[in-house]
């Protein structure tokens, strides 16, 4: 055979997003000779791994290899064989694994070790599996959406094709909602970032950015629901929890052991006189909203202003892209349109939550009941988080753009992560020749 088939003039990269509720594999592609240009990397495939998040495999680590097989095989099909050995593979685990690590560093390490061994068995250039920080998750999400929107580019050719046209180079803020955490990241206007933990400095394509970011662990939609249930069951008079965040007629039995399994509910934990309780939906948006607000401690703020729980938040500035579960939930509820005001969103949520469970099941027969039952809570939670948590108003609501994909690539942290690890975001404006690696961030 010939001495290594001449490589295609394109390159590929794989990033696995090991989230709290599931794992997704993303395949990216870019022209080899344009590595340092902005906007040239695009997503060619997303493969959702069947099953839960990797943190759920803590008692069955031997099943991780099989769990990852289908999507890794899909990657082998999509990427030309001649490129496999040169294709980097990265796995980043987010808040689900952060929570597991809080419970047991040993168990988290064991899961990651098996993940690493499984992924290294494939014929790719496996570069490691790690738990990324909340700060990284926020930063890479911000990089992704601004890269895809052409905000780092000086070339005006972009502005005829990107959505959310703003005709300027002002970056978008990033709002990311997962199952176990939520991130807010943006460039504040001439504002000192009072908390060093929330400050990031980037130099990208010759421009400096002072970025604010924070990740709220336990405030992803799934963990927020567990928190709310743990809080509300404290004051229930018996093993029936009448819950305004579920549709009228909805019933579900919850094990107390499951409720207290997560570190997110520890602050509400108490000895209950029962092992199980039953959620009975009453479907009332206003009451649900009020219950959710009790999860946000706004009574304490050591800074000029805070989001909640004493976390500094500068005044909101500019447009925001809201993605991941912000998008999925609002898309299901048909509330992603730019034309829908915050008041209209609230009205629609009131109507949706009040609909009887039997009616909802009939209307959305193709949707799994587990997910379907939680849209009332999730939609209400999103409104509560954005309005009371982050201080968006009816007026600034129009600056939130619910984004699934930009130019065919999913909005999320994975693209930014890969761009950084493959040194594809130069600190300076690229010259006609590629820069040495020493100039990268």
């Amino acid at each position: 055979t010939q001495n290594k088939a001449l490589p295609e003039n394109v390159k590929y990269g794989i990033v696995l997003d090991a989230g709290s509720s599931h794992t997704s594999l993303y395949i990216y592609k870019w022209p080899a000779e344009k590595e340092n240009d902005t906007g040239v990397v695009h997503q060619v495939e997303e493969c959702r791994v069947k099953g839960p998040g990797i943190s759920k495999f803590v008692q069955k680590v031997n099943e991780i290899g099989i769990y990852l097989t289908d999507c890794m095989e899909r990657a082998r099909e999509v990427i030309p064989r001649s490129q496999h050995q040169e294709t980097p593979v990265y796995l980043g685990a987010t808040a689900g694994m952060r929570l597991l690590r809080m419970e047991s560093e040993e168990l988290a390490d064991r899961v990651l070790d098996v993940v690493e061994r499984s992924l290294s068995n494939y014929p790719f250039d496996f570069q490691g599996a790690r738990i990324i920080t909340g700060q990284e998750e926020g930063a890479y999400g911000w990089i992704t959406i601004n890269y895809l929107l052409g905000k780092f580019s000086q070339k005006t050719r972009w502005f005829s094709i990107v959505p959310y046209e703003t005709n300027n180079q002002e970056t978008f803020g990033a709002l990311d909602l997962g199952g176990a955490s939520t991130q807010v990241t943006f460039v504040p206007q001439n504002q000192t970032i009072e908390s060093p933990d929330n400050a990031l400095q980037f130099r990208l394509y010759g421009k400096d950015y002072n970025v604010y970011t924070h990740s709220f662990l336990c405030y992803g939609k799934d963990q927020a629901l567990w928190q709310k249930l743990a809080k509300d069951i404290q004051v229930a008079s018996n093993e029936i929890l009448r819950d305004p965040c579920f549709h009228p007629g909805y019933k579900k039995v919850v094990n107390v052991s499951d409720l207290y399994k997560t570190p997110c509910t520890k602050r509400f934990e108490m000895t209950l006189p029962f092992q199980q309780f039953e959620i009975q939906g009453i479907g009332n948006y206003q009451q649900c909203h009020q219950s959710i607000l009790e999860l946000f401690n706004t009574s304490y703020c050591p800074y000029s202003q805070c989001a909640f729980n004493g976390i500094f938040l500068p005044p909101l500035q500019g447009d925001f892209g809201a993605f991941s579960a912000f998008y999925f939930v609002m898309k299901f509820l048909n509330l992603t349109s730019e034309k829908v005001s915050q008041e209209k969103v609230t009205e629609m949520m009131k109507k949706f939550c009040a609909q009887p469970w039997e009616e909802i099941k009939t209307s959305y027969a193709g949707v799994k009941e587990k997910y379907l039952s939680e849209y009332c809570f999730s939609g209400t939670y999103i409104l509560s988080l954005l309005l009371q948590g982050y201080h968006f108003t009816a007026d600034s609501w129009e600056h939130i753009h619910f984004i699934g994909k930009i130019q065919g690539s999913d909005a999320g942290w994975t693209l930014g992560y890969m761009l950084n690890l493959t040194n594809m975001i130069p600190a300076e404006q690229p010259l006609s020749t590629p820069l040495s690696h020493s100039t990268y961030v």
Partner: antibody, heavy 121, light 107 residues
Framework: EVQLVESGGGLVKPGGSLRLSCAAS????????MNWVRQSPGKGLEWVGE??????????HYAESVKGRFTISRDDSKNTLYLQMNSLKTEDTAVYYC????????????WGQGTTVTVSS | EIVMTQSPATLSVSPGERVTLSCRAS??????LHWYQQKPGQSPRLLIY???QSISGIPARFSGSGSGTDFTLTISSVEPEDFAVYFC?????????FGGGTKLEIK
């Protein structure tokens, strides 16, 4: 000319150790995954293990039958592949081939001439 | 691990005959199947890679086919120098595994 030349074989007692070497020439050694394959007398071929590149942190994979006893390493500056064999058993008696694939992966288009390892008391 | 089974173990043919050697994988390996020829006292030689891809320098009478679990190596007209042992190999996933071999002998 692309060439792989194994050395270091010989007679060793059960429980003993041996280190095989494979000198590569005619190609850019550091750019290719390298493998060891063995063949017992009158038997079929058995893959022993592989070592990947520096960029892959010199990752290794082994057949279950040798895991924990054999170690593959490489010295890219010397264009040499190694197989350190410890706790040898009689069933490790075989001709050991150093192999690589100069095109794509996980097949072997370049083979050494082999070196014989005999484990016997 | 993926088990590779070759049949028959021995095949007796006359020069000029058409020969088909079989290889079966215990699970689907797509087209990640490779064929080798080994003559006494020599190292194996790659004949076919990825089930059907021919190699420069290998006579055109050697061809491969198959996908999934069933594969064949065909020699359209056996020459005297083709009498040897033929091995198939799983190149899909680790551990890499070989079939037990088929010995092609003169009738």
């Amino acid at each position: 000319e692309v060439q792989l030349v194994e050395s270091g074989g010989g007679l060793v007692k059960p429980g003993g150790s041996l280190r095989l070497s494979c000198a590569a020439s005619g190609f850019t050694f550091s750019k290719y995954w390298m493998n060891w394959v063995r063949q017992s007398p009158g038997k079929g071929l058995e893959w022993v293990g592989e070592i990947r590149l520096k960029s892959n942190k010199y990752g290794t994979h082994y057949a279950e039958s040798v895991k924990g006893r054999f170690t593959i390493s490489r010295d890219d500056s010397k264009n040499t592949l190694y197989l350190q064999m410890n706790s040898l058993k009689t069933e490790d008696t075989a001709v050991y081939y150093c192999t690589t694939q100069l095109d794509l992966y996980w097949f072997f288009d370049v083979w050494g001439q082999g070196t014989t390892v005999t484990v016997s008391s | 691990e993926i088990v590779m089974t070759q049949s028959p173990a021995t095949l007796s043919v006359s020069p000029g005959e058409r020969v088909t050697l079989s290889c079966r994988a215990s699970q689907s390996i797509s087209d990640y199947l490779h064929w080798y020829q080994q003559k006494p006292g020599q190292s194996p030689r790659l004949l076919i890679y990825y089930a059907s891809q021919s190699i420069s320098g290998i006579p055109a009478r050697f061809s491969g086919s198959g996908s999934g679990t069933d594969f064949t190596l065909t020699i359209s007209s056996v020459e005297p120098e083709d009498f040897a042992v033929y091995f198939c190999q799983n190149g899909h996933s680790l551990p890499l595994t070989f079939g037990g071999g088929t010995k092609l002998e003169i009738k």
